[in-house]
């Protein structure tokens, strides 16, 4: 009998039935999984590898070096520290780590990967997991932050720093417990016949809840936007028929629906791609997953690249800070804000992300 | 049913190449790999290789790496099996087969194909 | 790679026999083994795969057992359309091999 050996790592199959005892496999290399679930692992760099790598590794430094810039300026400037400011200075936290996750998971991709063990791969997997939940976790407090504000008629919530640093607390520990599950025992180490072809450590489950769960965070997302929205509307038109000035209203109006366009277009375009692909790697047998999976996981990522530019680069005094920062230069308001200059400061940062407040008075 | 329908026996001379088809039907082909396996007279089964259609990866026996060239064409649901530069010793039965499992690579195969017999003679 | 070794390499049995063929795997293979049927001028016929689960429409006095690298294929009350050779064929991933095959011969 002629021997058999192969170059290209592969895969085996069902390990549970009615009448086995369950196997574990934490000593096997990840080419026994990988084997098993179809996905091809490299040996060697192709194109396609060195382009999603070379890209990969380009977006982390930018994710890290924007978020890192977003966090100081909202330490130094005394006119962000409001709940607001601290959430948008933690989701800036959150991409950084999603950077530094990525910037990992570059280093251990392709052929690369081989040399992965199981707990390794874990790993890897885990804190992509983490930061990202950490980002969309932070993204819906936001949301619910400003949702907040506007139905109060505020410009800043009058959470205290201690219920933000609790929110804060709560963010992190639900993003890495979320990261964890599949390291602690959500895998399909111990049932092999039901590992996931995109992960193939990850149990079909397990991917099923991860995108069911971000998506259903999306639709909380929308529907509080859109609550947000109606309302502003709503109240504008009111405002409307009884003010001289209906004009500034109405851009205020649209200001806060252009950010919520481009906040939750950058969402969709980023993530539903990824997510729906999870799930059809699950549902559809006959989708070809893996051809499409760098490319929207590398999508994913660019969502931590973009939410400084949205959430920050529109901010017109954050754009100072920035400046102020960059170049060296002494701030020339270090000082908390008084009423009037938060008032008068960041102007369009308030319009958008607080939502129904123009530059000298509320349109709520 | 279920079923792997082969293309018919093939003489080749020493040096030619020889592709065989292997076409599935009552099944999503898509949704299973299907390994080639090959057996000379009064032999034993020696397996060749391996495709799997959602993807389009192909797992080889290194005995015969850069001989056969495993492919499938999901329009039709046909695997195909190319083997080049044949000797007298590629003259076997060649069978295609379906992995018992879907949407993952099990490595046993419940449906068979009835053979193909190539004759490798001078 | 993973050699197989299948014993006896034939024997001769009467219907109403119960049979024991072994198979030996050169390393660990967990429970990943199946065995193959096979009649003159057909192709095999999976019997049992993960070492003892039987493929649907196989008769139960199949059974299978072992794990690791000793495995056995036991045919109780054997009939006369049992004849043929067995294949035995780790599962473990590529590359594949099988072993040598047990002919199973009417006495």
């Known amino acids: 009998m002629a021997a058999i050996s192969t170059s290209i790592p592969v895969i085996s199959q069902p390990q549970f039935t009615a009448m086995n005892e369950p196997q574990c496999f934490y000593n096997e290399s990840i080419a026994f999984f990988y084997n098993r679930s179809g996905k091809h692992l490299a040996t060697e760099w192709n194109t396609v590898s060195k382009l999603v790598m070379g890209l990969g590794i380009t977006v982390c430094i930018f994710i890290m070096l924007a978020n890192l810039l977003v966090m100081v300026a909202i330490y130094v400037n005394r006119r962000f520290h409001f709940p607001i400011y601290y959430l948008m200075a933690n989701l800036a936290a959150a991409d950084f780590f999603a950077g530094l996750a990525y910037f990992y998971l570059m280093f251990n991709t392709g052929p690369n990967t081989r040399r992965l063990t199981v707990s390794t791969w874990l790993l890897r997997q885990g804190l992509i997991d983490t930061s990202l939940t950490a980002s969309v976790a932070n993204l819906l407090a936001i949301a619910i932050e400003r949702h907040i504000t506007v139905f109060r008629m505020q410009l800043h919530t009058r959470m205290s720093n201690r219920r933000v640093v609790v929110v804060i607390v709560v963010i992190w520990t639900m993003a890495i417990v979320m990261g964890a599950i599949p390291s602690v025992g959500w895998n399909c180490i111990c049932d092999i016949e039901n590992c996931s072809n995109m992960a193939p450590l990850y149990s079909d489950s397990y991917l099923v809840f991860w995108a069911i769960f971000n998506l259903v965070t999306f639709v909380v997302m929308v529907v509080l936007y859109a609550h947000i929205f109606g309302y502003v509307r709503q109240r504008t038109m009111r405002m409307s028929r009884h003010s001289s000035g209906p004009r500034r209203n109405r851009d205020t109006m649209m200001s806060l629906l252009k950010t919520v366009v481009i906040v939750l277009g950058a969402f969709i375009i980023c993530w539903t791609p990824g997510l729906v692909l999870l799930l059809l790697d699950v549902c559809c047998p006959q989708c070809d997953v893996l051809a499409y999976e760098k490319f929207f996981l590398l999508l994913a990522e660019f969502n931590s690249a973009m939410n400084p530019i949205i959430y920050s680069y529109r901010d017109k005094e954050m754009s100072a800070t920035f400046r102020q920062i960059l170049c060296c230069q002494r701030s020339e308001n270090p000082t908390g804000p008084t009423e009037g200059s938060d008032r008068s400061a960041s102007s369009l940062n308030h319009t958008i992300l607080a939502g129904v407040h123009s530059n000298d008075h509320s349109v709520v | 049913q279920v079923q792997l329908v082969q293309s018919g026996a093939e003489v080749k001379k020493p040096g030619a190449s020889v592709k065989v088809s292997c076409k599935a039907s009552g099944y999503t082909f898509t949704s299973y790999g299907i390994s080639w396996v090959r057996q000379a007279p009064g032999q034993g089964l020696e397996w060749m290789g391996e495709i799997y259609p959602r993807s389009g990866n192909t797992y080889y026996n290194e005995k015969f790496k850069g001989r056969v060239t495993l492919t499938a064409d999901k329009s039709t649901s046909t695997a195909y099996m190319e083997l080049r530069s044949l000797t007298s010793e590629d003259t076997a039965v060649y069978f295609c087969?379906?992995?018992?499992?879907?949407?993952?690579?099990?490595?046993?195969?419940?449906?068979w194909g009835q053979g193909t017999t190539v004759t490798v003679s001078s | 790679d993973i050699q197989m070794t299948q014993s006896p390499s034939s024997l001769s049995a009467s219907v109403g026999d119960t049979v024991t063929i072994t198979c030996r795997a050169s390393e660990n293979i967990y429970s990943f083994l199946a065995w193959y049927q096979q009649k003159p001028g057909k192709a095999p016929k999976l019997l049992i795969y993960?070492?003892?689960t039987l493929t649907e429409g196989v008769p139960s006095r199949f059974s299978g057992s072992g794990s690791g690298t000793h495995f056995s294929l036991t045919i109780n009350s054997l009939q006369p359309e049992d004849f043929g050779i067995y294949y035995c064929q780790h599962h473990y991933g590529p590359p594949l091999t099988f072993g040598q095959g047990t002919k199973l011969e009417i006495k």
């Open positions: 087969a379906r992995e018992s499992i879907s949407r993952r690579l099990g490595w046993n195969f419940d449906v």
């Open positions: 993960n070492a003892k």
